[in-house]
């Protein structure tokens, strides 16, 4: 009754949960339940059922195989699923799936927190902002990654000639989907000049982005 | 929670037919089976049919057969079972018990109150 | 039909005891059995069925075994609550049988 299997999945998804072993040869009854007592859908070697419940209309059940395809996951349907099958000589087995949906992360803003020249240095805070998501973050200046250490949703390090890079890219991910922000500097410790600058980030998984000064919210010391 | 919950007691004349009432709740009605057993004053367990509240499907032990009708009533979630031609030998309690399955397995988790019918002149 | 056989028809125990209901079926019903528990004017309560599968909700002292014919029910250490009758019922085929139940009484 141990069998449990993890399943991430991108919302708006069609899902197929099923298990990896054959079924029993000859089971009687098949039952997905959608957390521990809702049933979605039962087969009786004749038909398949399938009951009132959130998702009637976007289920399928396989027989053959005991796959449960679902269209068009929402987080909503996040759960613990289990199949029950009822064998010929009346034991039943039950595997379950714990899925979890989860929405495509949106694309990050970067704030300017502060930046300041000090002597040759720049001292530089950047933020990553996304509204309220539980996501990885990683920071790249000219495309090359930052320390592990240093990589939260806020960037804040000391930039000297040597180490100057031109761009800092935030890339926001969950186990479903990437993307970047990223602004330009220009140096020794400005925001870039130009009214409008293109960045390219095709290189890091994300998309090209006209960004201006003015689309930037920082405070700018000197 | 899961409910099963019956109608009250019954006095009838030999003869006469029941009809009791099996009201479910708590769970989704049309995704299992009733089985009705009953229990004679001081005697063991007897099972008398089942339905399927799906599709109505039945099964009857041949002891009733003729004399018994099962039916549901999905949309109060309701199932019932009416006896006819009554003798005082079947006097007993009644009760509905859900299968584990929607089509019969033969296991039953929850079973209703019971239902007491008196069969007498 | 097939006959269900239990034994013994009743039984004195005390609190703390072990004990063990058997029930005979009159052929080979696989795993297909299930075991109930009535207390005196109350409904039956399902305590296993699948022969070894414990009823959600019931406690880890009852236990069941066997397949084919030959079956038991145990209480591993009774506790007060436990004093009722017990029944076994095959699942087998239509129609369902019970046994005639063994009742459990304080010694």
């Known amino acids: 009754q141990g069998h449990l299997v993890h399943m991430t999945v991108v919302s708006g998804s069609n899902v197929t949960l099923n298990i990896s072993e054959s079924l029993p040869e000859n089971y009687k009854q098949l039952t997905w339940f959608y957390t521990f007592d809702q049933k979605i859908v039962e087969w009786d070697s004749r038909k398949s059922k399938y009951f009132e419940s959130k998702f009637k209309g976007r289920v399928r059940l396989d027989p053959q195989s005991g796959a449960l395809y679902i269209s068009k996951v929402q987080k909503e349907d996040n759960s613990t699923y289990i199949m029950r099958v009822l064998k010929k000589t009346g034991n039943e087995q039950e595997w379950k799936i714990k899925l979890q949906v989860l929405d495509p992360v949106p694309k990050p803003v970067i704030k300017i927190e502060k930046i300041e020249d000090m002597d040759d240095n720049c001292y530089l805070k950047l933020s990553c902002v996304i509204p309220g998501e539980s996501v990885n973050y990683t920071w790249y200046g000219d495309k090359r990654p930052f320390p592990k250490e240093l990589q939260n949703s806020v960037l804040e390090t000391t930039l000297m000639p040597h180490n100057y890079s031109r761009c800092y890219t935030c890339q926001v991910s969950n186990s479903v989907s990437s993307k970047n922000g990223t602004v330009c500097l220009s140096p020794p410790c400005t925001l870039a000049r130009s009214e409008q600058k293109l960045i390219s980030e095709e290189d890091l998984g994300g998309e090209q982005k006209l960004i201006s000064e003015e689309d930037l919210h920082h405070h700018h010391h000197h | 929670q899961v409910q099963l919950v019956q109608s009250g007691a019954e006095v009838k004349k030999p003869g006469a037919a029941v009809k009791v009432s099996c009201k479910a709740s708590g769970y989704t009605f049309t995704a299992y089976g009733i089985s009705w057993v009953r229990q004679a004053p001081g005697q063991g367990l007897e099972w008398m049919g089942w339905i399927s509240a799906y599709d109505g499907d039945t099964n009857n032990a041949q002891k009733f057969q003729g004399r018994v009708t099962m039916t549901t009533d999905t949309s109060s979630s309701t199932a019932y079972m009416e006896l006819r031609s009554l003798g005082s030998d079947d006097t007993a309690v009644y009760y509905c018990?859900?299968?584990?399955?929607?089509?019969?397995?033969?296991?039953?988790?929850?079973w209703g109150q019971g239902t007491l019918v008196t069969v007498s002149s | 039909d097939i006959q269900m056989t239990q034994s013994p028809s009743s039984v004195s125990a005390s609190v703390g005891d072990r004990v063990t209901i058997t029930c005979r079926a009159s052929?080979?019903?696989?795993?297909?059995l299930a075991w109930s528990q009535q207390k005196p004017g109350k409904a039956p309560k399902a305590l296993i069925y699948a022969a070894s599968s414990l009823q959600s909700g019931v406690p880890s002292r009852f236990s069941g075994s066997g397949s084919g014919t030959d079956f038991t029910l145990t209480i591993s250490s009774l506790q007060p609550e436990d004093f009722a009758t017990y029944y076994c019922?095959?699942?087998?085929?239509?129609?369902?049988?019970f046994g005639q139940g063994t009742k459990l009484e304080i010694k």
């Open positions: 019922q095959q699942a087998n085929s239509f129609p369902y049988t």
């Open positions: 018990a859900r299968d584990r399955y929607s089509s019969s397995s033969g296991y039953f988790d929850y």
């Open positions: 052929q080979d019903i696989s795993s297909w």
